[in-house]
């Protein structure tokens, strides 16, 4: 049965408006490839409506299919020799609960300095998303160059 | 209080369906790095439902959080060309009103000929979005290679 | 007249929740540049809610404006490989019915090994979307590296 038929009498709130757009706060300590995010109007144009931050990682509050998107720009590009820094890779995944751990989206910086992508994926309440940046180059903290967000799309 | 609880008695129209997808019309004159856009069924698959064009720039008609996306492909380009003409950079931002001027999204063409990205951002009625392409290379006007759009996501 | 005013008395189901996220199944035989997709919970995190697969190609079931997104990563690839096998190009388009055949989105792998983009486009019930990968390099079948999806956005 299609969702909306069963749900059509419920208030609009039940459809979910969960959405978040985050900016980079800092990188992780040794042996921790995760990027740590922050969000909120005081910080600029980032926000959280529904999802929450848990120690810099994004935690989902509503089950559903989400559009997850990310852009990360390196603060300095790899040289044309590229192999000097290769591989620098970004992966977005569910990192907790451990039973649901999975990589959702993965990209490598080859001779470019920015990766950007998006995908649809089912997420459940309590899923925490982690963004792992592996390599020796630093990410830019400029808010128009590095950002990460999710948008609830449907149940 | 979550938005939709307060809004649940309003007609669906109040949720907003504002959306636009534009194709490149032309580049600016000297000293004007802006790309000028066009949209409408007569032109192909571009359209404006809510937002409007003001001298080739996209003006927002409804407050809310929007998904902004763009793809720009350089016209006569190979990885060698791209690196030789480096830096070529694309920035999407609010250019008016001046009090709200800010860069929302920025990407450089390094050794590639196409950039594509997307982000969530709050926009207000009257905000005009500009897309600035700096560098000496020209963008392709093919409608499957260069396009720019917004989609209203939530209040 | 704005859509939602006319539609506001209809059940929410009429707004459409059509969405799909697919993973790569296989490439085509010789002379067939199409990628063949698969989806469903048994396969992992891919799914079809509304659209259907027709011999590995995505068929639309509901008229409307859709957000189409794709990421394709080449399997055995470095920036040197990518440039040596140039041009490798990905195009997403309507391939049937023939009367509506058109390229919607096109990207080249220059010195990169991944392309990712998205766009808004009107699609009609019965439109079949094809993704053509031209060149000699094979796409990765990792579900976090290569995926293709659509999301209904508005009528």
């Amino acid at each position: 049965q299609r969702f909306a038929q069963a749900q059509q009498q419920l208030p609009l709130e039940s459809l979910g408006w969960d959405v978040a757009e985050l900016q980079l706060n800092h990188t992780g300590p040794q042996q921790d490839p995760r990027l740590y995010w922050q969000g909120g109007p005081a910080l600029g144009r980032s926000f959280l409506h529904g999802p929450e931050l848990d120690k810099g990682q994004l935690r989902i509050h509503r089950d559903g299919i989400y559009m997850v998107h990310i852009q990360v720009t390196l603060a300095i590009c790899s040289s044309t020799t590229a192999s000097r820094h290769h591989p620098t890779t970004l992966a977005v995944g569910i990192c907790s609960p451990a039973s649901r751990s999975i990589s959702l989206l993965r990209l490598s910086f080859h001779q470019g300095c920015t990766i950007a992508s998006q995908r649809l994926t089912p997420l459940a309440r309590g899923d925490t998303l982690c963004t792992n940046l592996t390599g020796t180059l630093l990410p830019s903290r400029n808010t128009d160059e590095t950002f990460f967000g999710v948008q609830w799309v449907r149940p | 209080q979550r938005f939709a609880q307060a809004q649940q008695q309003l007609p669906l129209e109040s949720l907003g369906w504002d959306v636009a997808e534009l194709q490149l019309n032309h580049t600016g004159p000297q000293q004007d790095p802006r790309l000028y856009w066009q949209g409408g069924p007569a032109l192909g698959r571009s359209f404006l439902h809510g937002p409007e064009l003001d001298k080739g720039q996209l003006r927002i008609h409804r407050d809310g959080i929007y998904m902004v996306h763009i793809q720009v492909t350089l016209a006569i380009c190979s990885s060698t060309t791209a690196s030789r003409h480096h830096p070529t950079t694309l920035a999407v931002g609010i250019c008016s009103p001046a009090s709200r001027s800010i860069s929302l999204l920025r990407l450089s063409f390094h050794q590639g000929c196409t950039i594509a990205s997307q982000r969530l951002t709050p926009l207000a009625r009257g905000d005009t979005l500009c897309t600035n392409l700096t560098g000496t290379l020209l963008p392709s006007r093919n409608t499957d290679e260069t396009f720019f759009g917004v989609q209203w996501v939530r209040p | 007249q704005r859509f939602a005013q006319a539609q506001q008395q209809l059940p929410l189901e009429s707004l459409g929740w059509d969405v799909a996220e697919l993973q790569l199944n296989h490439t085509g035989p010789q002379q067939d540049p199409r990628l063949y997709w698969q989806g469903g919970p048994a396969l992992g995190r891919s799914f079809l809610h509304g659209p259907e697969l027709d011999k590995g190609q995505l068929r639309i079931h509901r008229d409307g404006i859709y957000m189409v997104h794709i990421q394709v990563t080449l399997a055995i690839c470095s920036s040197t490989t990518a440039s040596r096998h140039h041009p490798t190009t990905l195009a997403v388009g309507i391939c049937s019915p023939a009367s509506r055949s058109i390229s919607l989105l096109r990207l080249s792998f220059h010195q990169g090994c991944t392309i990712a983009s998205q766009r808004l486009t009107p699609l009609a019930r019965g439109d079949t979307l094809c993704t053509n990968l031209t060149g000699t390099l094979l796409p990765s079948r990792n579900t976090d590296e290569t995926f293709f999806g659509v999301q209904w956005v508005r009528p």
Partner: antibody, heavy 120, light 108 residues
Framework: EVQLLESGGGLVQPGGSLRLSCAAS????????MSWVRQAPGKGLEWVSV????????DYADSVKGRFTISRDNSKNTLYLQMNSLRAEDTAVYYC?????????????WGQGTLVTVSS | EIVLTQSPGTLSLSPGERATLSCRAS???????LAWYQQKPGQAPRLFIY???SRATGIPDRFSGSGSGTDFTLTISRLEPEDFAVYFC?????????FGQGTKLEIK
């Protein structure tokens, strides 16, 4: 006021080791990437190594890779450079420098430097 | 590695004159990521210009930076006695970041 104070320089024989320190004050040390930059006597500047704000990411110039190790202790507001297998060509004034907040690789504050002399 | 060549090696001018210092890169790099530093004898370098043309905090407006691609210029519109020093350019667009060999600005 932002202050960076290097120490630990001195005379060392080729093949020897030295550990430089940089004490930071006047800013939130844990929020900034830091680098070491050196300057041979009468010469130009050469970037040596970088470490991210929390210390998880490091990078080195090819000339020192495998011999030098950068680290930091955010609880002590201190940056370190462990230099092993020193060579005559490592002789220089070593500066610690703070990256711009965006993480871009330009340096908005520098220490006064500490001289390292590698000679037999 | 990108090589930055500064010219002239030494520039002899008098206070009140205009100084033009050049920095040329062996290849172009990202988004005009070029900085200029001033260094006086026995002192650490001090950031003057970043992003090719943005003045750092506290730098007087007689200093201006320009250029793009491979050719960059630092201009001092009217020299003051405290401006005589060595000036280094630095590119931070492509790893590893690199510096020019410096231009010595001396009193004529």
């Amino acid at each position: 006021e932002v202050q960076l104070l290097e120490s630990g320089g001195g005379l060392v024989q080729p093949g020897g080791s030295l550990r430089l320190s940089c004490a930071a004050s006047g800013f939130t040390f844990s929020s900034y990437a830091m680098s070491w930059v050196r300057q041979a006597p009468g010469k130009g500047l050469e970037w040596v190594s970088v470490i991210s704000d929390s210390g998880g990411t490091t990078d080195y110039a090819d000339s020192v890779k495998g011999r030098f190790t950068i680290s930091r202790d955010n609880s002590k507001n201190t940056l370190y450079l462990q230099m092993n297998s020193l060579r005559a060509e490592d002789t220089a004034v070593y500066y610690c420098a703070r990256h711009d907040y965006s993480n871009r690789y330009y340096f908005d504050y520098w220490g006064q430097g500490t001289l390292v002399t590698v000679s037999s | 590695e990108i090589v930055l060549t500064q010219s002239p090696g030494t520039l002899s001018l008098s206070p009140g004159e205009r100084a033009t210092l050049s920095c040329r890169a062996s290849q172009s790099f990202s988004s005009n990521y070029l900085a200029w530093y001033q260094q006086k004898p026995g002192q650490a370098p001090r950031l003057f210009i970043y992003g090719a043309s943005s003045r750092a905090t506290g730098i007087p407006d007689r200093f201006s930076g320009s250029g793009s691609g491979t050719d960059f210029t630092l201009t001092i519109s009217r020299l003051e006695p405290e401006d005589f020093a060595v000036y280094f350019c630095q590119q931070y667009g492509i790893s590893p970041c690199s510096f020019g060999q410096g231009t010595k600005l001396e009193i004529k």
